[in-house]
Interface confidence: low
């Protein structure tokens, strides 16, 4: 289920207090919910407002809510209140944003928190043209696809290690689908990957998840056959016809913010090495020690645990407030081109422990639709047109959106235009140490 | 089995406001697909007016996107055209239909006449 | 908006005979993705349109197998290849690509 994608969208910083509060002089408070801010419909959330040992209130207030959304009395020691949400529906889905009043008055607005809402549409197709079989070196294009009028697709690749980016294709008239172009493949790109579809009007109401589709890379050096456990989807239906836009989305109107692995990643590296570290300083110690002392190790009963280290060992923090106690790091971008009309926002949320990574693609209809340069995809005719006449009778709403269980890493990209055409589809060939291959386009880690 | 039904006044007079309904049968609006309003001139000419999704999204001719409104009732599997300041070139039969592959179900039409 | 030109305007022939109505569009409705947003709708007398193909050439779910479509670009055909008296009406091409999506004017098939 869906809980598991548990990626917080990044908390916008560039959007201002709400003016009905006087905004006072205090710290903001931070704002993150709990399983994640992506919740399947039905299932329950708890958003999180932490402030100061001194707040005596807390509110949240929703975008478009009537204000305020809830109030809360602090839970001990009163840094921390609880909003609790049993069941998840589309009225509850959208922009947070937390307060806290002290003695001395009310705080700033916390960042928002989006709360995003999974399985409010059917699921969308997700094919790889020509083939989920790919060659090291070469091209395949992910295609997702609705059936019906969408605007906003996301594409999901568990565990990945680097942000995927994506070129919009032209929006057609009367369907919809997004491509995803990967090129040249490298064994990175191998994998699970999902999408959603969605609306521009909701941003934050998702379809239920494709079925995985699992690209192969063979030529890499790892085991090119599928798992057992997952099928390689390769079908694509007859939902590929293209989609009239929706309305106009307003320019200034719900941001989305796209979240990227650098921090994760980074912080990984830096646990990795310092446990490497460890093991080398225990590895170091064990060669010194006396015969008595190995023999007293031998003798400990079964049962006895080892004893435990001064720093308190590579422990995971359950709480996400914690997190934010510590670096927040948070990548931005605003790439903004006059000629494309294209700005894209990376930050990463403080708050995740298993990120996912997903790439966003929204059209905005904010002049008038040129074609688009887009990358020669070896689409095939037939791959595209396979007629299946009993596609509404086949045809699953699924109730569960069943994800995948595994951590996955989150990317969004927002387009304004039909004319973004950068060299975006090539990805990094891992950030593991290495710089980004695209400085204009991929995030320079910030720390805040 | 999927149908769909148009109803209307039958007659409106120049400037007022024409509100047609289309309910739907055998599928719920909101599962899927969009719902769209097309109109047929005397002399046959086909003209799409516009649609809403199944997840209320809407989309519309440009030629009428000053003065049409389409919604829905999903408690009842219905959805609505509304055509403001109407004149007597909006006289046509209006037809609801479906959209997938392609315009896959069509009501029957209702014949709507913009007459003082 | 795109124009769809048919021709002919109407088309006189026997039962049994080969019939093929061409559809120009002003402009390409080729998709980036290959596709090409073409479809063939009939409407027979006091009836609503029903559709036979799309995309081309793709038939609908029950249109019999006498009815294709072909063509690319800008340029496509409907053949019928034996007209039986239920196919009588008249035969509109739509593009599906450009907004607004546009019909054809419509090509009248009639006995001879």
């Known amino acids: 289920m869906i809980p598991t994608f548990t990626a917080l969208l990044c908390l916008g910083l560039s959007l201002g207090p709400r003016t009905h509060m006087q905004a006072g002089p205090l710290p903001k408070p931070t704002l993150w919910a709990e399983p994640g801010s992506v919740i399947s419909w039905g299932n329950s959330v708890t958003i999180w407002c932490q402030g100061t040992l001194e707040a005596r209130e807390y509110r949240l207030d929703k975008e478009e809510s009537p204000a305020p959304w809830d109030r809360q009395n602090p839970l001990e020691p009163k840094n921390k209140a609880r909003f609790s949400i049993p069941s998840m529906t589309e009225d509850y889905a959208g922009r947070y944003r937390c307060y806290y009043r002290s003695p001395v008055g009310w705080s700033q607005p916390s960042d928002p928190l989006e709360l995003v809402m999974t399985g409010a549409y059917s699921k969308p197709t997700l094919s790889a043209l020509p083939s989920p079989l790919v060659t090291s070196g070469k091209s395949v294009t992910l295609l997702c696809q609705s059936r019906s009028p969408m605007d906003t697709f996301l594409l999901i690749k568990e565990r990945a290690a680097h942000p995927l980016l994506h070129l919009r294709s032209e929006h057609g008239a009367q369907q919809h689908q997004a491509e995803f172009p990967m090129s040249p493949v490298t064994s990175v790109h191998g994998g699970t990957y999902r999408c959603f579809s969605s609306h521009g009007f909701s941003h934050y109401l998702l379809s239920h998840p494709s079925d995985p589709l699992e690209l192969i890379v063979s030529g890499s050096l790892e085991d090119p056959r599928p798992s057992p456990t997952r099928s390689v989807s390769t079908a694509a239906g007859p939902e590929d016809q293209p989609l009239m836009p929706t309305g106009s989305v307003p320019h200034s109107g719900l941001r989305r913010h796209w979240e990227v692995l650098i921090g994760v990643l980074v912080v990984s590296i830096l646990l990795l090495s310092l446990l490497l570290f460890l093991l080398l300083q225990h590895w170091r110690q064990g060669k010194h020690r006396t015969l008595a002392q190995r023999q007293a190790d031998f003798q400990r009963p079964p049962g006895a645990a080892e004893p435990e280290p001064k720093d308190g060992g590579l422990q995971r923090r359950s709480s996400p407030a914690a997190d934010v106690q510590g670096e927040n790091f948070c990548a931005a971008v605003k790439n903004t081109q006059p000629e494309d009309g294209v700005e894209m926002d990376t930050r990463q949320s403080p708050h995740d422990e298993d990120p996912q990574a997903v790439t966003y693609a929204k059209v905005k209809h904010s002049r008038p639709r040129r074609e688009m340069a887009s990358p020669p995809s070896p689409l095939s005719g037939e791959f595209l047109d396979t007629k299946d006449r009993q596609a509404e009778e086949d045809r699953q709403m699924d109730t569960e959106a069943a994800a995948s269980e595994a951590p996955q890493d989150v990317t969004y990209a927002q387009l304004h235009s039909f004319t973004l055409r950068q060299k975006a589809t090539e990805p990094p060939p891992s950030q593991e140490g290495a710089s980004p291959a695209e400085p204009s386009v991929y995030a320079t880690l910030a720390i805040h | 089995d999927v149908q769909l039904q148009e109803s209307g006044p039958g007659l409106v007079k120049p400037s007022q406001s024409l509100s047609l309904t289309c309910t739907v049968t055998?599928?719920?609006?909101?599962?899927?697909?969009?719902w769209n309003w097309i109109r047929q001139f005397p002399g046959n000419k086909l003209e799409w007016m516009g649609y809403?999704?199944?997840?209320?999204?809407?989309s519309y001719n440009p030629s009428l996107k000053s003065r049409i409104s389409i919604t829905r009732d999903t408690s009842k599997n219905q959805f609505f055209l509304q055509l403001n300041s109407v004149t007597t070139e909006d006289t046509a039969t209006y037809y609801c239909?479906?959209?997938?592959?392609?315009?896959?179900?069509w009501g029957l039409g209702t014949t709507l006449t913009v007459s003082s | 908006d795109v124009l769809m030109t048919q021709t002919p305007l109407s088309l006189p022939v026997s039962l049994g005979d080969q019939a093929s109505i061409s559809c120009r569009s002003s402009?390409?409705?080729?998709?980036?993705?290959?596709?090409?947003?073409l479809e063939w709708y009939l409407q027979k007398p006091g009836q609503s349109p029903k559709l036979l193909i799309y995309?081309?050439?793709n038939r609908f779910s029950g249109v019999p197998d006498r009815f294709s479509g072909s063509g690319s670009g800008t340029d496509f055909t409907l053949k019928i290849s034996r007209v039986e008296a239920e196919d009588l009406g008249v035969y509109y091409c739509?593009?599906?690509?450009?907004?607004?999506?546009?019909f054809g004017g419509g090509t009248k098939l009639e006995i001879k």
């Open positions: 739509f593009q599906g690509l450009h907004v607004p999506p546009t």
């Open positions: 402009q390409s409705i080729v998709h980036s993705n290959g596709n090409t947003y």
């Open positions: 055998g599928y719920s609006i909101t599962s899927d697909y969009a």
């Open positions: 995309k081309v050439s």
């Open positions: 239909a479906r959209l997938h592959y392609g315009y896959d179900y």
């Open positions: 809403i999704s199944y997840s209320g999204g809407t």
